[in-house]
Interface confidence: low
Amino acid sequence: SRGSCDSLCNCEEKDGTMLINCEAKGIKMVSEISVPPSRPFQLSLLNNGLTMLHTNDFSGLTNAISIHLGFNNIADIEIGAFNGLGLLKQLHINHNSLEILKEDTFHGLENLEFLQADNNFITVIEPSAFSKLNRLKVLILNDNAIESLPPNIFRFVPLTHLDLRGNQLQTLPYVGFLEHIGRILDLQLEDNKWACNCDLLQLKTWLENMPPQSIIGDVVCNSPPFFKGSILSRLKKESICPTPPVYEEHEDPSGSLHLAATSSINDSRMSTKTTSILKLPTKAPGLIPYITKPSTQLPGPYCPIPCNCKVLSPSGLLIHCQERNIESLSDLRPPPQNPRKLILAGNIIHSLMKSDLVEYFTLEMLHLGNNRIEVLEEGSFMNLTRLQKLYLNGNHLTKLSKGMFLGLHNLEYLYLEYNAIKEILPGTFNPMPKLKVLYLNNNLLQVLPPHIFSGVPLTKVNLKTNQFTHLPVSNILDDLDLLTQIDLEDNPWDCSCDLVGLQQWIQKLSKNTVTDDILCTSPGHLDKKELKALNSEILCPGLVNNPSMPTQTSYLMVTTPATTTNTADTILRSLTDAVPLS
């Protein structure tokens, strides 16, 4: 039978595919349609009266390769509505009345490549809405009311085209969003509510590192008021996110480097693009002599292409290779002689191999921030025995182990913020007996192994914006005997018996050691309450009457899943203290 082709719809065959046109036929239910069996077809139900898609509505349409549901009044899609559409490649559901894309909305569409859902009223996209769409390349969501996107929404989605125009987005973080859209060819972001503050620095840097011809339309600031109407790409990083007060050695804790730009060495093979570097803070007297001295430019052979170099007195080189599209350290040729500081921030380095840094044994500072490093081969830093500062912030690291840091006997500062670190193995920091400052904020940590800080002379530790619900004092925090500053805020603290130890430990520290308030997330009645202000009896009823009850587990393995709300609120609350970009 020819199904609806003989009655309701107009059908024609083209290149072996049936085109079934049921546009503007007053159809109220998908079940009114029947199609010829066993041949691929495209179905258009454009401009009808559909208001809801019910479970199994399309189960009789198994050979559909394209379905157009645009310009209906669909307000809800039941779970399983698309069952049976395993061959579907294109789904158009634009100009409807959808308000939410649920976890199971697109269940059954495992071959979908193109999804058009613009001009609805979408405000919420649930965290796994697209997770099964492992072939989706084109996603059109413009002209909805999306205020934020859940973390990892596109983790398993190979998007090449994403249209987010005309929504209510204020920021797009790197971790959980930008990191997952590396294949993107076309990203449209105009007409949103972009808040041009520190939170947007990650997006700005990411856009700058994309091929210059790829972004269509400008990201225009909506707030703060003095930036309203300004184009993000034209704003200086330091005006969007002023660097905090100058810390020791005139470097801020987020790792932004205050360095003077040097002109390119005269070499026709070199990139002509000069890299803009964060301006010097005015109160950095220690750097002024260095800046005002005329810079000694080196002859070509000594400065690796595509970098700029500067001689640091009395000897040694500052090598500036920031934002030069470098994929591997082996791209730096010829290897420099006597390098002292090597800045490779904002490149596209994916991995670091044992052989990459063998010739750099004179380095005192290495900046690898804002790359894409996932793999750090054990022993990569083995030769860097003079290194004092290592920046690995803004990469894709997920696990830390002892082998990664072998050789770093003199390291004092280690910046690991804004990665996706979930696990730190026992003994990780043992190869660094001089480590004073450790930044691990904005990662995915839930636990720390016992004795992780044992024998490490840390004075500053930043564990802010992770996934800690508990943190044992015994064998972890009580090893921090030289501590002058610890950041623990913005974690989903579970204010129950297991946190009594932490509360007591905090109360013993001197006033300014804990930088900000530690707020409870659970249980519900203590949400947003300050830990230090709570009575121990509230945290752990009956504690006083049961003095033998242990208040700490030495290595508490937290099994609570990092819920999406937590993740959205914590890991992906973007930079409030400036991403190190330089």
Partner: antibody
Framework: QVQLVQSGAEVKKPGASVKVSCKAS????????MHWVRQAPGQGLEWMGI????????SYAQKFQGRVTMTRDTSTSTVYMELSSLRSEDTAVYYC??????????WGQGTLVTVSA | EIVMTQSPGTLSLSPGERATLSCRAS??????LAWYQQRPGQAPRLLIY???NRATGIPARFSGSGSGTDFTLTVSSLEPEDFAVYYC?????????FGGGTTVEIK
Amino acid sequence: QVQLVQSGAEVKKPGASVKVSCKASGYTFTSYYMHWVRQAPGQGLEWMGIINPSGGSTSYAQKFQGRVTMTRDTSTSTVYMELSSLRSEDTAVYYCARGFTRYFDYWGQGTLVTVSA
Amino acid sequence: EIVMTQSPGTLSLSPGERATLSCRASQSVSKYLAWYQQRPGQAPRLLIYDASNRATGIPARFSGSGSGTDFTLTVSSLEPEDFAVYYCQQRYNWPLTFGGGTTVEIK
């Protein structure tokens, strides 16, 4: 100056495949997308697809999906377009063109592909 | 896909005259439209992008206007080398599509 140099003319039989190359010079190869556009004799221009030379990701026009493959070799700054299952209506001049916000600011000289039994 | 329609198909004019070419989109493409010139035996050349911006090295006699669905390319005073085929192209949505072309020939 920017130059896109394409491979020479090809004559193919129906059902065969053709692979056209486009060598870029005068700019940073991985910083600009490359598109392929074709023009049948006496006809207009038809966009075929795009490749990102940096990562290698591609997107093809629906019409060519399954028949076209675009690849690149960053070591030689060359992109390739392979079209399979050729039919007579694929006879055309094939151009590579550098992407400039989805417009085309530099074009190759074109490669004539003739499909004839 | 967005269909681009150019008119007229052919325009017969003399050197020094003003040429006005039209391009219409089947749906709004905002300002995201380009014009190309193609001389016989050559590859196309970008003239105008984003409806009204002249590409590098394009003489001032070429200008573009319009937004939404209706666009115009104007050549204020035709030079001998301007007799060619002109195409419009939208970049508002994928796939990228061209108009069928307008031939400007010598009268």
